[in-house]
């Protein structure tokens, strides 16, 4: 049968599985007269035979691992044994079968890993080989951890890359390995061929002993540093150490302080470089970083905590130059007159800021000294000996010593003796009626004036009136300001009124004095008044959740991609319809129900980014009120602009004839974004035919030089094509043309007879 198993002598390739006993011929070559017999030469290995009449066969099983390809030659001979045809190449490719098991290069491996090493970072490789064809599953190896000893809580601390045999820590291993608990582990690793996928795969195992070493790259304990140290600086306060020598250390101040008073040396010792002030900053948190010689971090940064310890370097300070209190003339012994609160900048709740109060002088000492008492630690002044009489002494001045453990400060207190508070404030009206206001009434508006009077001594705490809203305004939308001269109360709007949440409010006022009432006198109904606030609805425009909405997309997004969305709410709860305004480029559409914004045309960063449009939210129904917000679409660059010449280069010329080769410089640009390093263009001539006359050489990323290779140019214009590649992803190329004229020159300029003025070059080279 001509075709598959027989045919004329020609180059052929056959594929035969290894390991199979011969069961059929390879090929029957047909002789063309005058050829009568065939001869076989080449890598026969005494396996391949050709019979004289052209029958090619093999006589025993092949072994791919011995020879994967047998290169044979078959020639046809005439009756005299002379080659009349060929020899032609016959290639026998031996196809692989899985007849070799994988074997590890070592029966035992040893390695070490540092605790807290990065998960997934290999610290040891196991390696096996398989003589079978790696291009087939027969030689594709699959590594696995069979067992980890010890195994704690069924958690694997180690993992292996199934393809490469790289052993690394798992996340749990990185976090939990501790040489103090378990200094060594043993892994049994298996390797299978057939990519590990077949029941018929061969396998081998090896043992891996792993030592866990301590990671000394640890955050040190928090440091305490006393403020205002007078010791010579810098002072070593702590240290960090990388696991191996040669690390480069640095500190990172995450807080970006104007002055950062710490440094680190190349041993990893950390210093404070100047005295610290706790009152300026009481704690510092910064990071120590270890890098390799190339500046690459060796591990995560360590957090360093420095607490500044307080010393008593601040005296107490008085709340004001003179503190004024009032006391009623019939006030009883022990009554509180007021509290003097001094301050100390030293650390709170420590001895350094713990204050003592002591009265050092009373003037006048009438009717006696020691009329007042101050609580040593609280600073509360009390009446100590008897009730006071205004007509005898209307005012007392006290000098009070305030001290911490090292410093003393004098503070001054003035005590005014006032008439007794035996009259309550009385409202002129108990009901101020109804007041109707629109919900958009301005904040700060006075909406009502209320008045109470008090018959006690004018301009004292006994007659001064404070108005409080005690009912009906839990949101705190209203407030009352008091005129100190007239005790008139002005009810003002402090927060916006809201029809939707409080259409009617029943407000109750209370008028009271800052001074306590005398014993037996109580506030009664006369000190209370009410009014009803009715808020009317105002149809308010929808409110956007942001003034400006911003989104970021790649400029090459597909049409119809959602690029952002906006949200607005209507105070009355109506539906909202969204629309766009100012979409001058016609790039966007908005879903009028949801506010989602989609692209409807190709976007182009180079046309301008961000692209700004206005979004309008309109009430559906109601008064169709609307609000406007901004939508800014930031377009991220893709490399979609080929390089071009940076400017117009018409008018380049050389004076003819050239006395020596000349050159000119040109600049390229493109419209894509070039962050940090700028463009990196490469330049070449646009066609091979130009190479005899011109050469182009790169000067930098944007400029190149075009040079002549000889001086034998005709007197005419040459158009030189230049190929500029931007090296982007994907790389884009522009072919630009530089027109260069060779012309006769007069005084360094091109000379053209009259009538030939068109396109005169103006730049000489």
């Amino acid at each position: 049968q001509e075709g598959k198993f027989s045919g004329p002598l020609k180059p052929m390739t056959f594929s035969i599985y290894e390991g199979q006993e011969p069961s059929q011929i390879i090929f029957q070559f047909k002789a063309n007269p005058p050829a009568v017999t065939f001869e076989l030469t080449g890598e026969t290995d005494n396996i391949f035979v050709i019979e004289r009449e052209g029958l090619l066969y093999y006589n025993r099983a092949l072994d791919r691992e011995t020879r994967s390809t047998h290169n044979l030659q078959v020639a046809a001979l005439d009756a005299n044994g002379i080659i009349v045809e060929g020899p032609v190449p016959i290639t026998i490719k031996v196809k692989d079968i899985n007849d070799n098991r994988p074997t590890f290069l070592q029966s035992k491996y040893e390695g070490s890993v540092r605790q807290n090493s990065r998960p997934g970072k290999p610290f040891l490789y196991v390696n096996a080989t398989d003589l079978d064809d790696p291009a087939t599953p027969n030689g594709q190896l699959y590594y696995q951890i069979v067992i980890q000893l010890p195994m704690i809580n069924n958690v694997m601390y180690f993992q292996i890359n199934n393809k490469t045999g790289a052993i690394s820590l798992t996340r749990e291993g990185s976090q939990e390995l501790n040489p103090a608990k378990n200094p060594s582990y043993n892994l049994v690793i298996s390797v299978k061929d057939m990519g590990g996928q077949s029941e018929n795969s061969f396998s081998d195992t090896t043992s891996v002993d792993i030592i866990v070493t301590e990671n000394i790259w640890k955050a040190p304990k928090p440091v305490e540093m006393v403020e205002n140290s007078t010791d010579p600086h810098p002072i070593k306060i702590t240290q960090v150490r990388w696991n191996d020598p040669g690390a480069q250390y640095s500190l990172v101040d995450k807080e970006k302080l104007p002055r950062f008073p710490f440094s680190i040396d190349q041993e990893g010792d950390i210093y404070v470089t100047q005295p610290l002030d706790r009152e300026e900053k009481d704690a510092y948190v910064f990071y120590a970083v270890a890098k390799d010689e190339y500046g690459k971090p060796l591990s995560y940064p360590l957090e360093i905590h420095v607490k500044v310890k307080d010393i008593n370097d601040n005296p107490p300070t008085c709340p004001s130059p003179v503190t004024v209190f009032e006391v009623q003339e019939n006030e009883r012994l022990g009554n509180s007159i007021g509290t003097l609160t001094a301050h100390d900048r030293d650390e709170e709740n420590t001895a350094n800021s713990f204050l003592n109060y002591r009265i050092v002088e009373q003037t006048p000492k009438l009717p006696m000294d020691g009329l007042f008492l101050i609580q040593t630690y609280a600073g509360m002044l009390q009446l100590a000996k008897q009730s006071l009489k205004k007509q005898d002494t209307p005012q007392y001045n006290l000098t009070i010593e305030v001290s911490d453990k090292d410093f003393k400060t004098l503070c001054f207190v003035q005590i005014n003796v006032i008439d007794i508070n035996d009259q309550i404030p009385i409202f002129e009206k108990s009901d101020y009626g109804n007041l109707t206001l629109a919900e958009d009434t301005n904040i700060g508006s006075t909406i009502l004036t209320i008045q109470a009077t008090d018959a006690d001594e004018p301009f004292t705490g006994s007659s001064k009136i404070l108005y409080h809203i005690i009912k009906g305004d839990s949101e705190g939308r209203l407030g009352v300001d008091t005129d100190p001269h007239t005790n008139t109360g002005y009810v003002i709007i402090k927060k916006p009124l809201d029809f939707e949440t409080a259409a009617v409010s029943n407000i109750v006022f209370k008028a009271e004095n800052p001074e306590p009432l005398v014993f037996g006198v109580k506030y009664n109904a006369s000190s209370f008044a009410k009014f009803t606030l009715i808020v009317t609805d105002v149809n308010e425009a929808p409110q956007f959740s942001q003034h400006v909405f911003q989104a970021k997309v790649s400029e090459d997004v597909a049409i119809g991609t959602k690029v952002g969305n906006v949200t607005a709410k209507d105070p009355e709860g109506l539906d909202i319809s969204y629309s766009l305004r100012g979409d001058t480029r016609g790039w966007l559409k908005i879903d009028h129900v949801t506010g989602e914004i989609f692209s409807v045309a190709p976007l182009d960063r180079e046309a301008g980014s961000p692209y700004r449009v206005q979004v309008v939210a309109t009430e559906v129904g109601g008064s169709s009120l609307s609000s406007v917000s901004e939508f800014h679409l930031i377009l991220m660059d893709v490399n979609d602009n080929p390089p071009r010449l940076a400017k117009d280069y018409t008018g380049l010329f050389f004076c003819h004839p050239l006395s020596a080769p000349g050159s000119l410089i040109f600049e390229a640009t493109d419209d894509d974004q070039h962050l940090f390093r700028g463009p990196h263009f490469t330049f070449s001539l646009g066609s091979g035919s130009l190479q005899n006359d011109w050469e182009v050489s790169k000067i930098n990323g944007t400029h190149a030089r075009l040079s002549t290779r000889h001086t034998e140019f005709e007197e005419r214009e040459y158009v030189v094509l230049i190929r500029i590649n931007d090296g982007g992803r994907p790389p884009l190329e522009g072919i630009v043309s530089l027109p260069v004229t060779f012309c006769s020159c007069v005084e360094g300029s091109c000379f053209r007879p009259a009538g030939h003025q068109t396109g005169i070059p103006t730049v000489g080279m």
């Epitope: 539906d575 629309s579 009028h592 129900v593 949801t594 559906v620 129904g621 169709s624």
Partner: antibody
Framework: QVQLVQSGAEVKKPGASVKVSCKAS????????IHWVRQAPGQGLEWMGA????????SYAQKFTGRVTMTVDTSTNTAYMELSSLRSEDTAVYYC??????????WGQGTMVTVSS | DIQMTQSPSSLSASVGDRVTITCRAS???????LQWYQQKPGKAPKLLIY???NLASGVPSRFSGSGSGTDFTLTISSLQPEDFATYYC?????????FGQGTKLEIK
């Protein structure tokens, strides 16, 4: 009371167009968005698009863009949905529905459109 | 588009039973814009629950809704004869609005 009343059943040939009307009563059409939803025999509900009668703004499901047109006539308080280039798989009941805060609180009674050669 | 998948597609129950229908979204949905509708044969759908858990006007209190993110449920605490119908969830958190494929509730 508030209701939406739709036009009667239609039988159309493939390639033709159909225009279904939806008349609002008991409220003003411009007070709410109008949506169109269809339901093929024995199948679920499929949203086709919406129109804001106040200014004619609309949004259509991608599947129907280019074939559907939603309009309103505020003088007669009526919304319309026109579907062109009809094919047999457009055979369905077409509903109009009014939305408030994006939920469909009032529905028309439905219009059966049959597409058959 | 957000796909809404209801389960089960159909279920048989008896009067008085407590029934729960779930609706899972292919991506997160704002709970303000998740609705449930009831549809009886030959009739237009009827709004049952809006904004995940609010009962529409005139809907009996045995119906309730809950959920957030991608998982939502409709519960009927004690089935009545008039509750046998097909139930649909719908999202309008993002356009296009999409419905679940429906759950047919039949008498056992």
């Amino acid at each position: 009371q508030v209701q939406l009343v739709q036009s009667g059943a239609e039988v159309k040939k493939p390639g033709a167009s159909v225009k279904v009307s939806c008349k609002a009563s008991g409220y003003t059409l411009t007070s709410n968005n109008i949506h169109w939803v269809r339901q093929a025999p024995g199948q679920g509900l499929e949203w086709m698009g919406a129109i804001y009668p106040g200014n004619g703004d609309n949004s259509y499901a991608q599947k129907f863009t280019g074939r559907v047109t939603m309009t309103v006539d505020t003088s007669t308080n009526t919304a319309y949905m026109e579907l062109s280039s009809l094919r047999s798989e457009d055979t369905a009941v077409y509903y109009c529905a009014r939305s408030f805060r994006r939920y469909f609180d009032v529905w028309g009674q439905g219009t059966m459109v049959t597409v058959s050669s | 588009d957000i796909q809404m998948t209801q389960s089960p597609s159909s279920l048989s129950a008896s009067v008085g039973d407590r029934v729960t229908i779930t609706c899972r979204a292919s991506s997160s949905v704002s709970s303000s814009y998740l609705q449930w509708y009831q549809q009886k044969p030959g009739k237009a759908p009827k709004l049952l629950i809006y904004s995940t858990s609010n009962l529409a006007s005139g809907v009996p209190s045995r119906f309730s809704g809950s959920g957030s993110g991608t998982d939502f449920t409709l519960t009927i605490s004690s089935l009545q004869p008039e509750d046998f119908a097909t139930y649909y969830c719908q999202q309008y958190s993002s356009s296009p609005s999409t419905f679940g494929q429906g759950t047919k509730l039949e008498i056992k």
